[in-house]
């Protein structure tokens, strides 16, 4: 049966993003419509047809355009994605003979981790803090020279859609740690990044 091939995309906040649909059919469509899926009913964004060309709805005028003007292959591009653009989008190919054939492509917005790593001595212990803020929520791990060191983790969600994960490493005998390297590992979207800190006695 006739189908539409799509691919989900994950792009960085405030960068361009493109979503593509391909009608697997011998014949082109008469008109292509892109809609954003919403809880109640889909919202029309843009249409393309031979009759009327590209027609962008006012709410999307400065946000998107159709960058592949096809009636079999259609691509929309967001110039500068925001968190509001995250979601799923439907492309509808209105075909002669077989009506509306649709596909769905989803856009996920990510924010690269911003990491801070610092330490603080108290009289009898050492606290090393690693904080990572990203979207989706990052994970924070420690690599330390010896085992048995406790840590505590706090997660905080921000209104802008990012999440901060703060992990504090509690070292009871700080003298043994002086001159040694501690590594904070941040896992985000399948990639682990090491942040190294050597403890010096201040």
């Amino acid at each position: 049966q006739v189908q539409v091939v799509t691919q989900d995309e994950r792009e960085q906040l405030y960068t361009p993003a493109s979503l593509k649909c391909s009608l697997q059919n011998a014949q082109e469509a008469l008109i292509v419509t892109w809609q954003k899926k919403k809880a109640v009913s889909p919202e029309n964004m843009v249409t393309f047809s031979e009759n009327h060309g590209v027609v962008i709805q006012p709410a999307y005028k400065d946000k998107i355009n159709i960058t592949q003007l096809g009636l079999q292959n259609s691509t929309i591009t967001f110039w500068n994605i925001t968190l509001e653009d995250e979601g799923c989008y439907m492309c509808l190919f209105n075909t002669f003979g077989f009506g509306k054939i649709s596909g769905t492509a989803c856009l996920t917005v990510y924010v690269q981790p911003i990491v801070s790593l610092h330490y603080k001595f108290s009289e009898d212990h050492l606290n090393i803090t690693c904080s990572a803020t990203a979207r989706p929520a990052p994970m924070v791990f420690w690599k330390v020279p010896r085992s048995g060191i406790e840590n505590s983790t706090v997660t905080l969600s921000h209104p802008n859609g990012t999440t901060s994960v703060t992990s504090i490493l509690h070292i009871k005998d700080p003298k043994n740690q002086v001159g040694k390297e501690v590594i904070c590992q941040v896992l985000h979207l399948g990639t682990v990044t090491d942040f190294k800190q050597t403890v010096n006695k201040g």
Partner: antibody, heavy 117, light 107 residues
């Protein structure tokens, strides 16, 4: 040159089935939809259904309540329209045509199907 | 189903006349309308598609217009070979439906 050649006239009894063929030549068969329309004596044209030979997907006018089946044989570049449970009001000339999207350009010569007891 | 109503049902005209045939849909068909010419014992011949686009090889005296529910076929100057029956077809919604036809006869 492009041609759609239909099978010959048929006389059928009520309750029987008829299968009309439409042989395409002069173009790539899978690039165009094949459609079927009919015209009873003194009546308007009536769209029966169509097939996309590329996939074999078809769409039928529900008026025919499952009596119509449109198929194709890509190796023979031929489309078929079968109408079952024939009744006298199915007496008509049956035409196949081809379309690229909504651009209709070639038609078969028509096949007269007479349903009579 | 969408109903297509053509008017007039028949029309007498002379060679050289300007003739207009109209087709009214029971709902908006988004300009998805074709016009066909049919002569007795012959297959229909496509003249216009998508309301106003002329099919290749069709003389420029034929033109189509309209939008929404109301559509028109105009023959600017009738020729002897134009006397035939004309049908409109909507293909906005399945099942696709034809008008009842307009028979154009020589006066």
């Amino acid at each position: 040159q492009v041609q759609l050649v239909q099978s010959g006239a048929e006389v059928k009894k009520p309750g029987a089935s008829v299968k009309v063929s439409c042989k395409a030549s002069g173009y790539s068969f899978t690039d165009y939809i094949i459609l079927w329309v009919r015209q009873a004596p003194g009546q308007r044209l009536e769209w029966m259904g169509h097939i996309d030979p590329y996939y074999g997907s078809s769409n039928y006018n529900l008026k025919f309540k499952g009596r119509v089946t449109i198929t194709r044989d890509t190796s023979a570049s031929t489309a078929y329209m079968e109408l079952s449970s024939l009744r006298s009001e199915d007496t008509a000339v049956y035409y196949c045509g081809r379309s690229k999207r909504d651009y209709f350009d070639y038609w078969g010569q028509g096949t007269l199907v007479t349903v009579s007891s | 189903d969408i109903q297509m109503t053509q008017s007039p049902s028949s029309l007498s005209a002379s060679v050289g006349d300007r003739v207009t045939i109209t087709c009214k849909a029971s709902q908006d068909i988004n300009s998805y309308l074709s016009w066909f010419q049919q002569k007795p014992g012959k297959a229909p011949k496509s003249l216009i598609y998508r309301a106003n686009r002329l099919v290749d090889g069709v003389p420029s005296r034929f033109s189509g217009s309209g939008s929404g529910t109301d559509y028109t076929l105009t023959i600017s100057s009738l020729q002897p070979e134009d006397f035939a029956t004309y049908y409109c077809l909507q293909y906005d919604e399945f099942p696709y439906t034809f008008g009842q036809g307009t028979k154009l006869e020589i006066k």
